[in-house]
């Protein structure tokens, strides 16, 4: 009688994360008697994946009812694939032994390979915030995926961008892969309502990619621009003066009046008027009564944005042209913009 | 669901002999093999040996090999240890144990006293 | 035979504590063959960890296992009151099939 053979019949399968594994196996013979085992790797070191007489294997279940007496078909089911279960596995024949059952013959082999899937790209921007012309750094990462083949690309308001780092590790074999990829931006004015996308392309996800964003709203700080006028008086001895506080962005903005370097109001911008690019106005006004003023007055609006430096702008208030009242000590009346004090 | 239920306990005099059945239900009894465990009193654990059912075939602790026969009946789906010539240090629970060692019986007291 | 030695005999530790079973084998075990068990007091034994780090079904995760060749480690990370019972690896890479002497592991 011929020899006993063990046919493994696929030299690979191609398995998706999560799914089951068939892995076919069948002998020629029923004899010797003895037990069919898998494993996974050869060598010593070699993973026990089955066993059918001994041993835990709640993953594997067999093809055929292996208690059967002609039986000679030993495929198994794996469940729940992931990628660690990549790997060559062996359909092994046990010959019966004392004390332990002896190695007899084994299949060629079948390699399982594992697609998986890449996890959500994770888009993450600068700690700090950077102002327009700045270039800042984007970094987009995905993990758990194979095979290694991966494709990214980077967008800014759905255009391409083309100045970037990606690195896909390890760089040898594994059972599953990250990719890591660092994108440089040039900020401009508009950037408020942008948006930076990161776009992961792979074979398991069937040509629909994965995206990972970042709004520029949380990397973008756009400086105010001030303006100091003078309006028309709007009575006797007392002038309006308004700072208006231009484009800027994020909202967190104090504003502080000076008087000739002397603290005359502090206040926080609340009420303001978004432009359609995202960014921000805002105007607050000064009433100032002139008559309590010997000589002219330099006026100064002083601006803290969202906890950069101060910027201010001044403006030079005449007083000469105007009657001074006697006995007056008060140096100024200060109203918000939203406020009328009438004396 | 996967039950091995074990016979009563048995109090032995020493040089007896005494079979501990356990019989199986809720799996294909013949899918795997069937051991067999012992715990002194205050003791650790003790393999006494195996049997497969598809063939009867049957390993044994050299510890025990001349004294312990490991038997089954497909039919009742039974697997039985007989343990001869008792001794007092014998007195142990006896378990039986599928061979995926997840299922175990609740365990048999055997007492080997004069 | 395969000789499976544990350690210590008896672990005395507070709820909340990590602990830490150690089972040494008097020749290499491929860690496939390496089981843990816990048993307590009037109980069968029941499975805890197969192929040396793999938990068994209802087995909670604060349990872990690691090692191979010689040197095996069962892990409580953070011990709960009924984590209190007798822990036993067992091998079954050879014949005869052996267990450890048991690391009991009691409330201090």
């Known amino acids: 009688e011929e020899e006993l053979q063990v046919i493994q019949p696929d030299k690979s399968v191609l398995v998706a994360a999560g799914e089951t594994a068939t892995l076919r196996c069948t002998a020629t013979s029923l004899i010797p008697v003895g037990p069919i085992q898998w494993f996974r790797g050869a060598g010593p070191g070699r993973e026990l994946i089955y066993n059918q007489k001994e041993g835990h294997f709640p993953r594997v279940t067999t093809v055929s009812d292996l208690t059967k007496r002609n039986n000679m078909d030993f495929s198994i089911r794996i469940g729940n694939i992931t990628p660690a279960d990549a790997g060559t596995y062996y359909c092994v024949k046990f010959r019966k032994g004392s004390p332990d059952d002896v190695e007899f013959k084994s299949g060629a082999g079948t390699e399982l390979s594992v697609r998986a899937k890449p996890s959500a790209p994770v888009v993450s921007g600068p700690a700090a915030r950077a102002t327009p012309q700045h270039t800042v750094s984007f970094t987009c990462e995905s993990h758990g995926f194979s095979p290694r083949d991966i494709t990214l690309k980077w967008f800014k308001n759905g255009n391409e961008l083309s100045d970037f780092q990606t690195n896909v590790d390890p760089v040898g074999e594994s059972v599953s892969y990250s990719i890591h990829s660092t994108a440089k931006v040039v900020l401009t004015r508009e950037d408020v309502h942008s948006q930076v996308i990161c776009e992961v392309a792979h074979v398991t996800l069937q040509g629909d990619p994965l995206r990972g964003t970042a709004n520029l709203s949380e990397t973008i700080r756009v400086p105010p621009t001030l303006e100091v006028t003078q309006q028309p008086v709007r009575a006797e001895n007392q002038v309006n003066v308004t700072c208006q506080v231009r484009k800027f962005y994020p909202q967190r903005l104090q504003l502080t009046w000076l008087e000739n370097g002397n603290v005359s109001r502090t206040e926080t911008a609340s009420t303001v008027t978004e432009n359609k690019d995202g960014t921000y106005n805002w105007m607050s006004w000064l009433l100032v009564n002139v008559s309590a003023h010997r000589d002219d007055v330099k006026l100064t609006c002083q601006v803290e944005h969202d906890g950069q430096p101060a910027v201010s702008k001044s403006h030079d208030l005449k007083v000469s042209a105007h009657p001074k009242e006697q006995g007056s000590n008060t140096a100024a009346e200060n109203t918000g913009s939203n406020e009328r004090n009438i004396y | 669901q996967v039950q091995l239920v074990q016979s009563g306990a048995e109090v032995k005099k020493p040089g007896a002999s005494v079979k501990v059945s356990c019989k199986a239900s809720?799996?294909?009894?013949?899918?795997?093999?069937m051991h067999w465990v012992r715990q002194a009193p205050g003791q650790g654990l003790e393999w006494m040996g195996r049997?497969?059912?598809?063939?009867?075939?049957?390993k044994y602790n050299p510890k025990f090999q001349d004294r312990v026969t490991i038997t089954v009946d497909t039919s009742t789906n039974t697997a039985y240890m007989e343990l001869s010539s008792l001794r007092s240090e014998d007195t142990a629970v006896y378990y039986c144990?599928?061979?995926?060692?997840?299922?175990w019986g609740q365990g048999t007291t055997v007492t080997v006293s004069s | 035979e395969i000789v499976l030695t544990q350690s210590p005999g008896t672990l005395s530790l507070s709820p909340g504590e990590r602990a830490t079973l150690s089972c040494r084998a008097s020749?290499?075990?491929?860690?496939?063959?390496l089981y843990w068990y816990q048993q307590k007091p009037g109980q069968a034994p029941r499975l805890l960890i197969y192929?040396?780090?793999n938990l068994a079904s209802g087995i909670p995760d604060r349990f872990s296992g690691s090692g191979s060749g010689t040197d095996f480690t069962l892990t409580i990370s953070r011990l709960e009151p009924e984590d209190f019972a007798v822990y036993y690896c067992?091998?079954?890479?050879?014949?005869?099939?052996?267990f450890g002497g048991g690391t009991k592991v009691e409330i201090k």
């Open positions: 809720g799996f294909n009894f013949e899918d795997t093999y």
């Open positions: 049997i497969d059912p598809a063939d009867g075939d049957t």
């Open positions: 020749s290499s075990v491929s860690s496939s063959y």
């Open positions: 067992h091998q079954w890479y050879s014949y005869p099939r052996t």
């Open positions: 192929s040396t780090s």
């Open positions: 144990v599928r061979g995926n060692y997840v299922n």
